[in-house]
Interface confidence: medium
């Protein structure tokens, strides 16, 4: 069962899945100037049996300019750098969910993929939140949200996470410089598409933060 909505947005925070439940779909999106090959998959699907899970289908991109070739251009160094880390490298990282049965790891990048990944999550998926660079969490413990099914509807639990600017301790958090304003992450009320671009770029920077950066909702 697909989750109807995106995980909750938290001011000055981004989220990431450590691993993906079977049934999760990842759109095969190509960067500007490239397109999916004609016979290529629309999405990758996390599938598996009792002992092993993996991504079915492969995403392939080809240049939009050359119609009859599947020649793939090697990404430039800065593009490779942007994709370098797809998991939180923080020492506060939760248990590796990918070691659990029924979960797939982050799929490796494919050549000329779009700069943002769009996932379709399923019930039971857990995502973890982290404050963006320059902000620290005022809670401790894993900041997680889980997609749950209640009365036939899906919902994400609300993580109890506050991110505040470290330089500003005499006033309420949120009044600091708007560099990490959540406006940069528009969300659709009806879409179940989830993007992780911001997270992939920012976790490299945020991984060096010393403070505990996660917390959780209790119910």
């Amino acid at each position: 069962e697909l989750c109807d909505d995106d995980p909750p947005e938290i001011p000055h925070a981004t989220f990431k899945a450590m691993a993906y439940k079977e049934g999760t779909m990842l759109n095969c999106e190509c960067k500007r100037g490239f397109r999916r090959i004609k016979s290529g998959s629309l999405y990758m699907l996390c599938t598996g049996n009792s002992s092993h899970s993996s991504w079915d289908n492969q995403c392939q991109c080809t240049s939009s300019a050359t119609r009859n070739t599947t020649k793939q251009v090697t990404p430039q160094p800065e593009e490779q750098k942007e994709r370098k880390t797809t998991e939180m490298q923080s020492p506060m990282q939760p248990v590796d969910q990918a070691s659990l049965p029924g979960h797939c790891r982050e799929p490796p990048p494919w050549e000329n993929e779009a700069t943002e990944r769009i996932y379709h999550f399923v019930v039971g998926q857990m995502v973890y939140y982290q404050c963006v660079q320059g902000y620290r969490a005022l809670h401790r413990g894993p900041a997680e949200s889980v997609c749950k099914m209640t009365h036939g509807k899906t919902r994400w639990t609300q993580p109890q996470l506050i991110c505040t600017g470290e330089m500003e301790t005499s006033q309420f958090p949120g009044e600091e410089k708007p560099q990490a304003s959540p406006e940069g992450r528009p969300e659709s009320e009806t879409s179940c598409l989830v993007t992780t671009t911001d997270f992939q770029i920012q976790t490299e920077m945020a991984a060096t933060m010393e403070t505990s950066i996660f917390t959780t909702e209790y119910q």
Partner: antibody, heavy 116, light 107 residues
Amino acid sequence: EVQLVESGGGLVQPGRSMKLSCAASGFPFSDHAMAWVRQAPKKGLQWVAYISYDGDNTYYRDSVKGRFTISRDNARSTLFLQMDSLRSEDTATYYCTTGGNSGYDWGQGVMVTVSS
Amino acid sequence: DIQMTQSPSFLSASVGDRVTINCKASQNVNKFLNWYQQKLGEAPRRLIYGTNSLQTGIPSRFSGSGSGTDYTLTISSLQPEDVATYFCQQYSSWPWTFGGGTKLELK
């Protein structure tokens, strides 16, 4: 089950002090930011003070800055609000709340009346 | 501070009615908006978080919508137990601020 129980309210004269306490149970208190919210009679709600899980970061609304002090005792799972130089406009019901993104759980509140 | 303006401030409706309460922010709050219900003599309780996510245990007749500066709480079919004061609250920017409240009563 999460429980937040406030105490220490009552009638106090302007300029005097009062200390509120909030006993927490049913959740890992030392992992969570906490806050005090107040509601004047027949009025809306106002965030008053906020404290990080470890007590290292505290925040106050402008009107109480320098007069109120929020603190916590994680060993006793208790939140405090020390209110000095009280004014008549501080008269309100004071609620203890888990910080969260909005105040996920609330106590039943304690009434503070500042009057001569 | 971000100002939150609720309308109407008072509302009278009949059981079974569809009720809508509006909340306008003085600036974009990026869907970081919650709705609370406060019954007489009780503490507020959160109904909706993040504009449209229903809090656990809250009946599905409550729903939220909106974006930018304009938000709405809808009760699809009013029940007697819904008599209360309703508050919106933004958590986009500190200090978090509440609307002035909408008092809902039965006709």
